[in-house]
Each structure stands twice: as C-alpha cells, then as structure tokens.
C-alpha cells in the first residue's frame, strides 16, 4: 500500500495505490483511491508511467481528456467515471501487455488540494491449475495442467499424508510454449499416488501462486483450486 500526500501551496490530499499484477492478454486494474470531492468538475485524475512521455490517462471536468495520451495506451484505458465522485481513480487497462509493467503514478487534483502515489505494476501470465487422474498411465498417476504462465514457474507437489516429502523423483514437469510465443502451458505428472490422500500441485512465479488439490477415495474425487497474486502491497 502506498499513501502519497500532496506538496504545494494548496492543501495536500491522501492518495492510496495498491501494487498489483496484470495477466497478459486480459484486462487489468491499477488501483488508486483519494479523498473525494463534492464536485466532479473539480476533480482531475492523471495516470503517468515512468519512462513514458505521454500520459497513460487523464480525466478532468467529468470526462476523459486523451489528447496527450501516449500511443502505447491508445484505446486501452478507462476510469470508472461513475465512481470518481466517491474517490475511486482506479484505471482499467485493456489487453495487458508484457511492456505495461513498470512504475505508475496516480496524480489527483481536487478543490481540497493535490496528491499522488506510485504503484508498481507487474505483468505476466497466471492461471488456475486443474488436477485430474491420468487414466492413460500404467500406474496410479495424477496430472496437473495450467494453460498460461509467464515467467516460467516452479512446480512442487505435496501431500497431506506425507508432509514434507520430496516428490521430485516421482514427478515430471514440462513447459510447452503457447501459440503467441510468450506464455507457456504447464503440465506436471505425479506417479505412484495412493487413495485417501490429498495431493497438491503448487505452481508459482514472482507474480502469482496457484494450487490445485485432489483427493481420490473409493467413492469420489474431490478437487479444489485457488490462485493468489503475490506482492499486493498498498502505498
């Protein structure tokens, strides 16, 4: 969490951002909030990116002002116009690219004063893993698949019964480049598994950590998966 204060003759206002991550090819949110103003027409929002000459986005007098927007962001940005009045300056970024990573500044002017805060934005690819029973294998085998990751993640298997066990000798992980030549499909196979035991396939890079769990019993297969973005620090 980054909290910034204005520095000028006017009063300063508090601006708060949260470091976040964008999933390549999908839409992302750069989060920024500020002390709200009564009049929308008195609020100016500017998003800037370190190393980029033009603006990322500007919103003033109740509407977008994109005359100085940098080419790399053309047609890809929007604020939540109906939420600006309540202090939400978050930016929606469409079709996130690897090159969108960097340091952004959320700069706010209201009738109360000015303020800004920086935001670290990481980009990559992450997806939920799915763990299934591999019926094509000769022994009891599990297969963990996740369609899109970048940078290349680590994959670790764990089990509830054999806590702390190292499964690297009985697992095999491969990374297959997807058609856009950036992200990769992750496939990991775990051999010689047993029933009535929960196995977890954990995939992690510097952006996200995802886990897929499976438990096979005589009567059912239970699955669960979750994904967590790393380094979501507020400023």
């Amino acid at each position: 969490l980054i909290i910034g204060f204005g520095i000028s003759g006017r009063h300063s206002i508090t601006v708060t951002t949260v470091a976040s991550a964008g999933n390549i090819g999908e839409d992302g949110i750069l989060s920024c909030t500020f002390e709200p103003d009564i009049k929308l027409s008195d609020i100016v929002i500017q998003w800037l990116k370190e190393g980029v000459l033009g603006l990322v986005h500007e919103f003033k007098e109740g509407k977008d002002e994109l005359s100085e927007q940098d080419e790399m962001f053309r047609g890809r940005t929007a604020v939540f116009a109906d939420q600006v009045i309540v202090g939400n300056a978050s930016l929606r970024l469409k079709n996130v690219q690897l090159t969108d990573a960097g340091t952004y500044k959320c700069y706010i002017i209201t009738s109360k004063g000015k303020g800004n805060a920086n935001l670290e934005y990481k980009t990559g690819a992450f997806s939920m893993p799915e763990v299934n029973v591999d019926y094509n294998a000769s022994s009891e085998t599990l297969r963990c698949e996740a369609p899109r990751w970048f940078p290349q993640p680590t994959v670790v298997w764990a089990s509830q019964v054999d806590q702390g066990a190292n499964f690297s000798e009985v697992s095999n992980t491969s990374f297959e480049l997807n058609s856009e030549n950036v992200t990769m499909k992750v496939v990991s196979v775990l051999y010689n598994v047993t029933i009535n035991n929960t196995y977890s396939c954990m995939i992690e890079n510097d952006i996200a950590k995802a886990t897929g769990d499976i438990k096979v019993t005589e009567s059912e297969i239970k699955r669960r998966s979750h994904l967590q973005l790393l380094n979501s620090k507020a400023s």
């Epitope: 029973v133 019926y135 029933i195 096979v216 019993t217 005589e218 009567s219 059912e220 297969i221």
Partner: nanobody
Framework: EVQLVESGGGLVQPGGSLRLSCAAS????????MHWVRQVPGKGREWVSR????????SYEDSVKGRFTISRDNAKNTVYLQMHGLRAEDTAVYYC???????????????WGQGTLVTVSS
C-alpha cells in the same frame, strides 16, 4: 446400500463364449468406473477389465486382451463382460466392483457381490 449382483457364469468348453452381467444398485451408477475382477479358487484376486462412466474408455489385463469385451448400459445400471475364446486358465469366480476412477489396485475395491463362477473344461 451398495449392491452388485453378478450372473451369467457356467460350464463352457475351451474356445467357447459366455456373457457375464452385473446389476448395480444403491449408488449413482453413472458416477463410477466399473471393473471386473476374477479369483481362481485358492488364489488371490486379479483385475480383469474396467470401463469409464460414459463408456469412452476401456482397458484389459494383458491375458484377456482381444478375447474379452467390457460394456455397460447406464439405463439399466448394468455392466457386462463378453468372453470369447475361453481357456482353462480363465476358470475363476468373476466379480464386478466399482471405483471412483480407473485405478485398479485390488485393495482399493470395497464393494463386492457374490460372484459368478466360470468353469472352462472339456
């Protein structure tokens, strides 16, 4: 309560054919893989064949490949084992059982019927 009732066994000459049936009740049949297992009198149980819930996947123990065919009728909650080219070594009590997956370690199976005896002899 899970119930599995096998039928169709009998005495058959070498090279002959039989069709075994297993009527299942007490559980949602379409949620389970069904398996056939056999036991030669005085010996341990041996897995024979399996079929997936939608019949899209089947597999067999090596010694019965090309001679036995497993099938199922989900409308009737019944699994079948069609046996051709029977040999003396196929003589056994045949059981059907269920499991949540296609895995087929004998110790994983919990529900058994009374079995049906197949005797191959001239």
């Amino acid at each position: 309560e899970v119930q599995l009732v096998e039928s169709g066994g009998g005495l058959v000459q070498p090279g002959g054919s039989l069709r075994l049936s297993c009527a299942a009740s007490g559980f949602t049949f379409t949620d389970f893989w069904m398996h056939w297992v056999r036991q030669v009198p005085g010996k341990g149980r041996e897995w024979v064949s399996r079929i997936s819930p939608d019949s899209s996947s089947t597999s067999y123990e090596d010694s019965v490949k090309g001679r036995f065919t497993i099938s199922r009728d989900n409308a009737k909650n019944t699994v079948y084992l069609q046996m051709h080219g029977l040999r003396a070594e196929d003589t056994a009590v045949y059981y059907c059982t269920r499991f949540s997956t296609g895995w087929h370690r004998i110790e994983y199976f919990q529900h058994w019927g009374q079995g049906t005896l197949v005797t191959v002899s001239s």
